[in-house]
Interface confidence: low
């Protein structure tokens, strides 16, 4: 019995831009070839338990097989590399989750309001849905001093943890980042006293 996975899928953490092509490879270990009396031509690729058509599969050499997907659209696919051994007994080699989505759009329409004596709330339009875990961070600074970052919980707004100083201009912008990219909004420059919400 083998004490490790029989091989690995690369990339191990696939994140693909929706609508693009993607290729993964499965590399079998030498010990696996000998243990199961197989080579890469015995590999069966599966997505969500369904066999991938042979025309999408290429045997690169005795240890390595590749699979190519065109126009990836599903948000999440369980991709597995399997081998047919000992008279068609299927053994799972390795499995990864392939995620697809979009890089973040440049956040737009950034606006902030100040709750008198309390805090400041900034809101923005994140653009299209990314379908991926996307972190939005509100950044702010005054002259050369940086204020603490504000990590957005919902992706469209953030309540800053500090009380902004009046009568000095601060610069505020949003950074959006996921596995496919990172982008910043245009910054806005204002005196917080001008953004006080009327009570």
């Amino acid at each position: 019995q083998l004490l490790e996975p029989c091989g690995y899928i690369y990339p191990e953490f696939p994140v693909v831009q929706r609508g693009s092509n993607f290729t993964a490879i499965c590399v079998l270990k030498e010990a696996c070839l000998q243990h199961y009396y197989v080579n890469a031509s015995y590999i069966v690729w599966k997505t969500n338990h369904a066999a991938v058509p042979r025309e999408q599969v290429t045997v690169i050499n005795r240890t390595t097989s590749s699979v190519t997907f065109t126009d990836v659209v599903l948000p999440s696919v369980q991709l597995t590399c399997n081998i047919l051994s000992f008279g068609q007994i299927e053994q799972n080699v390795y499995g990864v989750t392939m995620l697809s989505g979009f890089p973040p759009d440049k956040p737009t329409n950034l606006t902030c309001i100040v709750n008198e004596g309390k805090n400041m709330l900034c809101q923005w339009d994140p653009g299209r849905e990314t379908y991926l875990e996307t972190n939005y961070t509100l950044k702010s600074e005054w002259a050369t001093e940086k204020f603490p970052d504000c990590q957005s919980k919902h992706g469209t707004s953030c309540m800053v943890s500090y009380m902004p100083t009046y009568y000095v201009n601060i610069e505020v912008w949003v950074e959006a980042e996921n596995a496919l990219g990172k982008v910043s909004s245009e910054s806005i420059n204002f005196d917080p006293v001008d953004k006080v919400k009327p009570t």
């Epitope: 191990e12 953490f13 696939p14 994140v15 969500n48 338990h49 999440s76 369980q78 499995g95 990864v96 989750t97 995620l99 991926l132 875990e133 596995a179």
Partner: nanobody, 114 residues
């Protein structure tokens, strides 16, 4: 801030059972496949098991198949590894990790010895 905190490791006799837990925070847990990996003394990281985001698909290394069961609770953002019929060769530090996120926890020590 992504955080993964394993617990449940212990000293256990061969043939015994343990249940490891991994509490996740700082990311949308249900979006991601999760996995357990382990590192035995003086060895490299070894993949143990993976589970899809919804929990419907599970995968195991040959060495643990039939003895270990991976599961998840997406309501409480927790990953589990039920380990039965433990063997001395299961002795290792066990880590949970999130697929597609370059993070893993600090690990929990499992020692199988008589």
């Amino acid at each position: 801030q992504v955080q993964l905190q394993e617990s449940g490791g212990a000293l256990v006799q061969p043939g015994g059972s343990l249940r490891l837990s991994c509490a996740a925070s700082g990311f949308t847990f249900s979006y991601y496949a999760m996995k357990w990996v382990r590192q035995a003394p003086g060895k490299g990281l070894e993949w143990v098991s993976s589970i899809s985001g919804g929990g419907g698909a599970t995968y195991y290394a040959d060495s643990v198949k039939g003895r270990f069961t991976i599961s998840r609770d997406n309501t409480n953002d927790t990953l589990y590894l039920q380990m039965n019929s433990l063997k001395t060769e299961d002795t290792a530090v066990y880590y949970c990790a999130a697929q597609n996120l370059d993070y893993r926890g600090q690990g929990t020590q499992v020692t199988v010895s008589s």
